[in-house]
Interface confidence: medium
């Protein structure tokens, strides 16, 4: 497993290959939007710090009936050490800020790209 330097995670950290696959899936979502992603559904914003994967899953799992993000939800569940169900929230959510799923996915993508650019996963 690859260590995220300075990135305290409460569980297993995804290996480089798995994270690459997640990034590519997020790329596919952001680049191939023909209509508003998930019909413009809103989700809670999260702090992109420790426990990010679980927090991201907790936000996205509340979006139902959106096939475009189902694979992302499955991939995130593999990165989160505990079971996440709809309606579950951690302190990592910015509970006063909701954003569109499209913006959420892009923010997550850019953060993961930044980790790679900083040499965390080369």
């Amino acid at each position: 497993l690859t260590c995220l330097g300075g990135f305290a995670s409460p569980g297993p950290v995804p290996p480089s290959t798995a994270l690459r696959e997640l990034i590519e899936e997020l790329v596919n979502i952001t680049q191939n939007q023909k209509a508003p992603l998930c019909n413009g559904s809103m989700v809670w914003s999260i702090n992109l710090t420790a426990g990010m994967y679980c927090a991201a899953l907790e936000s996205l799992i509340n979006v139902s009936g959106c096939s475009a993000i189902e694979k992302t939800q499955r991939m995130l569940s593999g990165f989160c050490p505990h079971k996440v169900s709809a309606g579950q929230f951690s302190s990592l959510h910015v509970r006063d800020t909701k954003i569109e799923v499209a913006q959420f996915v892009k923010d997550l993508l850019l953060h993961l790209k930044k980790l790679f650019r900083e040499g965390q996963f080369n």
């Epitope: 690459r20 990034i23 680049q31 850019l110 790209k113 930044k114 080369n122």
Partner: antibody, heavy 122, light 108 residues
């Protein structure tokens, strides 16, 4: 320190051929996509072609597809652009550029060579 | 194919703020990079991933991207900022890199 050094430019007649080279140093060449970008005199930047780190995927602008071929030799840390059936409108400074990430659809170019001038004229 | 539209020129007095726009259909869904090019020189990346700055680029340079417009903002403009500026994205529908037409920044 990242360095990109283009060579191979010069004067060629319409219909002729030319091969540009770009010698790279200061980074793990095979880990990054590379690209050629050109600039006609007094005009803006125009993307020409790109190639993945492994060389397995190539991309071309419509204006050069079928005439230009991009390739790379990772053992020599060198990028190439074979230009055939050259036209007057191909006259430009050709820049070699290093992509900032492994995922093609996230490409920005963080390092550029100084360029080599290609003049197509009879 | 995807088109990025930039104003041909922007003029600003020293010390003021320059804003250079880059328009594109739903560009907010794409990742935008900005380059500075001075006469006779190669382009230099000044903002990547919509709003991040490479090391060595002054904090005066910043970027934003939402809706149909990405913006490069240069605060406290200096004479040395006079250059051409280009925005760039990847267009997944064509598998092409796309550059804007460029904006000439003139410092009055």
């Amino acid at each position: 320190e990242v360095q990109l050094l283009e060579s191979g430019g010069g004067l060629v007649q319409p219909g002729g051929s030319l091969r540009l080279s770009c010698a790279a140093s200061g980074f793990t060449f095979s880990s990054y996509a590379m690209s050629w970008v050109r600039q006609a005199p007094g005009k803006g930047l125009e993307w020409v072609s790109a190639i993945s780190g492994s060389g397995g995927s190539t991309y071309y602008a419509d204006s050069v597809k079928g005439r230009f071929t991009i390739s790379r030799d990772n053992s020599k840390n060198t990028l190439y652009l074979q230009m055939n059936s050259l036209r007057a409108e191909d006259t430009a400074v050709y820049y070699c550029a290093k992509a900032d990430f492994w995922s093609g659809t996230l490409w920005g170019f963080d390092y550029w060579g100084q360029g080599t001038l290609v003049t197509v004229s009879s | 194919s995807y088109v990025l539209t930039q104003p041909p020129s922007v003029s600003v007095a020293p010390g003021q703020t320059a804003r250079i726009t880059c328009g594109g259909n739903n560009i907010g869904n794409k990742i935008v990079h900005w380059y500075q090019q001075k006469p006779g020189q190669a382009p230099v990346l000044v903002v990547y991933d919509d709003s991040d700055r490479p090391s060595g680029i002054p904090e005066r340079f910043s970027g934003s991207n939402s809706g149909n417009t990405a913006t490069l903002t240069i605060s406290r403009v200096e004479a040395g900022d006079e250059a051409d500026y280009y925005c760039q994205v990847w267009d997944s529908s064509s598998d092409h890199v796309v550059f804007g037409g460029g904006t000439k920044l003139t410092v009055l």
